[in-house]
Structures are given as C-alpha cells and as structure tokens.
C-alpha cells in the first residue's frame, strides 16, 4: 500500500485555495476527475467533479469550488473561493476509472482555515469578481456516487497549491448546481 502523505495549507477566511493536482499520464486526460473531502470515520465525499468525459480547459463550478482540467499539461486545477472556517479538513483529487476504484492523486491537502482575513500585498479582492456575476447556466452534477476509502496503486507527482485573495461571495450550499464559467484570455 502507498503511504498517504499530506500537504498542509493554512489560510484565512475569505481567501482562495488554489491547488493543482498533477495526473501526468495522457490516459487520464479525458477521465472524469473529482475533488473530495475526507472526514474522520467516513467515506470520501465528492464535492465537485468534472464532466464525463472531462473537457479541456472548461471550468466547472459547484458552489464555491471551481474545477478546471488542463489536458495539455496533465493538471487539474481546483479552486475553493471565499473560504470559511468550516471548510477546514482533509481533501483529495481523484480520477474516476470505472469499474476500477478511483485513482487518488497525491498528496492529500490538509486545509486549515482560520478567522480574520489578512490581505496579501498587491492583491485585489475584486480581481475575478466579474466572472461570477455573469448569468450562469446550470446543470445537474453527474458525479458518481461510489467512492472508495482505499488508496490506489502508484502515486503520480505531488500536487501544488498557492494562495490568493477572495474571489466571490458564493456559498457552498447546493452542490448539484454546476456553473459554466467563461474563460477570459
């Protein structure tokens, strides 16, 4: 069994977690991918997933979570905007590959969100505000219900994450609503 490792990120309320999960292999490019939370004693819970097949550079938004799959670089970008203290927890990216178990992308992310916003130098709180004001088209999320608590074979290289300031005031309430976010060049 592969040893589970974690990367810890300590952020303030209102900030954005920006994680890049590295899946490396072309065979995974079109596979459906998901962002899950792992709570003690529970099965991993899928919070958001890409489409099936996963579309290239096509943002999918579920509440305050935005997934964007970059096939050409083997990266799944996960953003959780306007973080709340209750978002603290252990997260992971997985690749669905039915009928096999989901393929977990290492490392897991240990997110710790604390009270009190602390702005970063040169940051703009409204930098992407307009993106989320565009009238959304919504559809039902088609995330597989099955999740496995077990880990899967080999681990691709680590994910990386960085920090930015708040992007919006979207609340993570109805996780079945997906918003297509236009891409601006």
């Amino acid at each position: 069994a592969t040893k589970l490792t974690e990367e810890k990120y300590e952020l303030k309320e209102g900030q954005t977690l920006d994680v890049k999960c590295d899946y490396t292999l072309e065979k995974f490019a079109s596979s459906q991918k998901a962002w899950q939370i792992i709570r003690d004693g529970e099965m991993p819970k899928t919070l958001a997933c890409t489409e099936r097949p996963s579309k290239n550079s096509h943002p999918v938004q579920v509440g305050r979570i935005i997934l964007e799959d970059y096939h050409d670089h083997g990266l799944l970008r996960v953003r959780m905007v306007n973080l709340q203290v209750e978002d603290s927890g252990l997260y992971q990216c997985v690749i669905y590959q039915p009928p096999k178990e989901p393929h977990m992308l290492f490392d897991r992310i240990r997110l710790v969100v604390t009270k009190g916003f602390s702005g970063t130098p040169g940051s703009n709180e409204n930098s992407t505000q307009n993106v989320y004001k565009i009238p959304p088209t919504t559809t039902k999320a088609l995330c597989p219900l099955y999740t496995s608590p077990r880990t899967v074979t080999q681990a691709p290289p680590k994910s990386t994450a960085d920090v930015s300031t708040p992007d919006s005031e979207i609340n993570l309430t109805n996780v079945t609503d997906i918003i297509r976010v236009p891409v601006f060049n």
Epitope: T24, L25, E26, K27, S30, H73, G74, L75
Partner: antibody, heavy 121, light 111 residues
Framework: EVQLVESGGGLVQPGGSLKLSCAAS????????MHWVRQASGKGLEWVGR??????????YYAASVKGRFTISRDDSKNTAYLQMNSLKTEDTAVYYC????????????WGQGTLVTVSS | DIVLTQSPDSLAVSLGERATINCRAS??????????LHWYQQKPGQPPKLLIY???NLESGVPDRFSGSGSGTDFTLTISSLQAEDVAVYYC?????????FGQGTKLEIK
C-alpha cells in the same frame, strides 16, 4: 529497468531516406509519449519531435527544421517508435536519440545511446 | 517558438567552488505555478542525463549539490561545490509549449 535502443542509422545521400527505430523495454510503452532529439557533432541538442499516445490519437509534433520531411510513428504492440526521415539534407547529420518523458509535457528521464545518421554524397 | 538562451556559454570554476548557469526564456514557460523547465548534464560520448525537472526538483540519484531555481522566464542551475565529475555541458529545456526547445548549452570546466 527502462531501456531505449535506437537502430537504423547509417550513411545516406542527400535527398535520400532513412528509417530509425527505437525499441523500448522495462515500462508500459503505450502509456508514454516518445520523442526524438538530435545532436550534430560538437553542437547542442535539438528536439526533433514527439508522438503522443493512443489516448491522444497518436498526435505528432515537429521542430520547424524537419516538418514535412520527417514522420514519427509508433507500434505499441512492438514497443517501438520510429522516425522516418525523407529528403535528407547534409545538415541532418547528427546522432539521433530516442527519449521517453515522464508524462504530459514532463521531463526526459530516459534516453537511448543514440544512432548516428550521416548525410553525405 | 520559445528561445532559451543560456549564459555563460562556457564557465571555468575551481574545485569546491560554486558554479552558476543561467537560462532565460523568450517567453514564460510556466503554466500556473509549474515551470516546465528542466536541466540536463551531458558528458562526451554519452546521452544527456536529467538533473533537475520543473525548475527546482532534483531527479532521483542526482547529488544534492545540484539545485535549480527560477520561474517564468529566468532560471538558474547551481552546483554548490564543484566536483571533478561535474565537468560537462549543461542544457536547459522547456516543455511548456510545442515545439520543445533546448538552450544552446554551457560548457563547464575546472579552473
């Protein structure tokens, strides 16, 4: 252990053709893109091109200097990549290396020993 | 095409001293916070050997006197304490965009 072995090099006249092979072992060949890199004597490295996997419809990409003259192909059942070189020029004289990356747009972790192609009349 | 320019073209450093090689890209080789810039070492008669991948990650089995840094367009390969076996030509290479490209190489010698 990953091994890449190039073959097919030799002396060819300008305007002629040559087909290089790269026999791979020690890994799941069909999973990775394969690349060709060349090096003229005493000169630097030049990326020639790459072929992606079946998942990416075996898409190929080439350096401008060889586009339209060179063709990269692969046979996953034989664990072999190929470089078909047509309309050869004297400036194509070089050692040709076969390389394997570590995944999508990743680094070249594995290299063959190279095969020498000499284009001369 | 992304042009990679290495400096200097050649470098002579005393044993035990620090060697620094720079690589400048004509445009960014970053995608998000990943720099798709790698460093290779090549000795005469041998194929290149990977030293550093994605700007700063040390390849398995490579001595830790080698390190890489940088992002965007400016990158550096550093050998903290030059050893005799480090005499070679060093190349940077980008894979962020097709066509992939190499720097022209830097020849490292002992002073």
């Amino acid at each position: 252990e990953v091994q890449l072995v190039e073959s097919g090099g030799g002396l060819v006249q300008p305007g002629g053709s040559l087909k290089l092979s790269c026999a791979a072992s020690g890994f799941t060949f069909s999973t990775y893109a394969m690349h060709w890199v060349r090096q003229a004597s005493g000169k630097g490295l030049e990326w020639v091109g790459r072929i992606r996997t079946k998942s990416s419809s075996y898409a190929t990409y080439y350096a401008a200097s060889v586009k339209g003259r060179f063709t990269i192909s692969r046979d996953d059942s034989k664990n072999t990549a190929y470089l078909q070189m047509n309309s050869l020029k004297t400036e194509d004289t070089a050692v040709y290396y076969c390389t394997r990356d570590m995944g999508i747009r990743r680094q070249f972790a594995y290299w063959g020993q190279g095969t020498l192609v000499t284009v001369s009349s | 095409d992304i042009v990679l320019t290495q400096s200097p073209d050649s470098l002579a450093v005393s044993l035990g001293e620090r060697a620094t090689i720079n690589c400048r890209a004509s445009e960014s080789v970053d995608t998000f916070d990943y720099s798709f810039l790698h460093w290779y070492q090549q000795k005469p008669g041998q194929p290149p050997k990977l030293l550093i991948y994605r700007a700063s990650n040390l390849e398995s089995g490579v001595p830790d006197r080698f390190s890489g840094s940088g992002s965007g367009t400016d990158f550096t390969l550093t050998i903290s304490s030059l050893q005799a076996e480090d005499v070679a030509v060093y190349y940077c290479q980008q894979s962020n965009e097709d066509p992939y490209t190499f720097g022209q190489g830097t020849k490292l010698e002992i002073k």
